[in-house]
């Protein structure tokens, strides 16, 4: 008789999840000499321990504490790039501008990027059928709590000028309900962070509007200013050219506005 299994609204755990996490850990520690000391089996055990045998709607930040300790990594505080709804371009940028870091350029972010996972209360099984959806089921699910925890800590670490890449093609360029809007903005430390600089990425080829005047950007400016952090904003009209100019800054076409 098949065991009754909780059906959640979201997709199940990514197939080959344990193997993927372990392989990513090994790859990351091989590429980054400063993380060579990390024991990837211990990392996987700590990751697994955060959600296995626990109700997937009752996960806490404390559940991830052992993993957070094992993944400790000093990030240059003045080289942090946050992003919202424009992950691919942010990652393309840090692949070229190697001294800047998104969360997914850290070990913990790299391990979990684009993956889904959850377990079941009182069994050691991973649920590959379904996992809780943040909206339809519960917010304290393994994936959401993980990203909330690491995003908060990543924002806490930032100093000097912090950059954020925002998607100018979205109806809400700045969304208060995004991870950036609900977690990272509120965990920037005014004693350390002088300025938040937003880069608004344009989507349309002929879009010459100043999206820094968008009402949601003004809302972001207001939130940041109230936290005693300065705010600045730049339009990136041509993201393709922007990336090209990061690669080849001495190119003659890179002196004009991008």
């Amino acid at each position: 008789v098949p065991r009754w299994r909780q059906q959640w609204s979201g997709p199940g755990t990514t197939k080959r999840f344990p193997e993927t996490v372990l392989a990513r850990c090994v790859k990351y520690t091989e590429i980054h000499p400063e993380m060579r000391h990390v024991d990837c089996q211990s990392v996987w055990d700590a990751f697994k321990g955060a959600f296995i045998s626990k109700h997937p709607c009752n996960i806490t930040e404390e559940d991830y504490q052992p993993l957070m300790k094992l993944g400790t990594q000093t990030v240059p505080c003045n080289k942090i790039l946050l992003w919202s709804r424009i992950k691919d371009l942010a990652h393309q940028f840090t692949q070229v501008q190697r001294d800047m870091f998104t969360l997914e350029d850290t070990l913990l972010g790299y391990l979990a990027d684009d993956l889904t996972w959850c377990g079941e209360f009182n069994t050691s099984k991973i649920n590959y059928q379904s996992c809780p959806d943040w909206r339809k089921d519960c917010s304290n699910n393994p994936v959401s709590v993980f990203w909330k925890t690491v995003s908060r800590r990543f924002a806490e670490a930032a100093c000097d000028v912090v950059h954020v890449m925002l998607n100018g093609s979205r109806s809400k360029i700045f969304d208060k309900n995004s991870t950036f809007g609900s977690v990272e903005v509120h965990n920037l430390q005014p004693e350390k962070v002088q300025t938040l600089e937003a880069w608004v990425i344009h989507g349309g080829r002929e879009d010459s509007r100043d999206l820094c005047q968008d009402p949601t950007i003004k809302e972001l400016e207001s939130i940041i200013s109230k936290r005693n952090i300065q705010f600045s904003c730049k339009n990136i009209y041509r993201p393709d050219k922007f990336l090209q100019c990061v690669k080849n800054p001495e190119d003659s076409s890179c002196t004009s506005e991008i």
């Epitope: 504490q65 300790k69 400790t72 806490e156 670490a157």
Partner: nanobody, 116 residues
Amino acid sequence: QVQLQESGGGLVQPGGSLRLSCAASGSTLRLYDMGWYRQADGKQRELVAEITSGGSTNYANSVKGRFTISRDNAENTVSLQMNSLKPEDTAVYYCNAEHTFMGAYWGQGTQVTVSS
């Protein structure tokens, strides 16, 4: 850069008490998880107790019910109250400050000796 300085170590009889204190520099120390570790002669350093930035505590099984960790974010201190001390608690005790993306820092250590 975080700097940590332990104090309060010394010689105490079995069953006695000591209070270790760790003074820390740095305006954002409240963001760090703070811990006490110990290292006995010829042994590896081991976690004694930790308190997260959110205030959650965790203790080694060997000290549960005897030791209490606390923090004062306003004063930038973390303390370890040690009661019912045993000879096997003899070690150098180290203060630790750790943040996932800001790194880990250690004090120089303070000697605790439990002996009659």
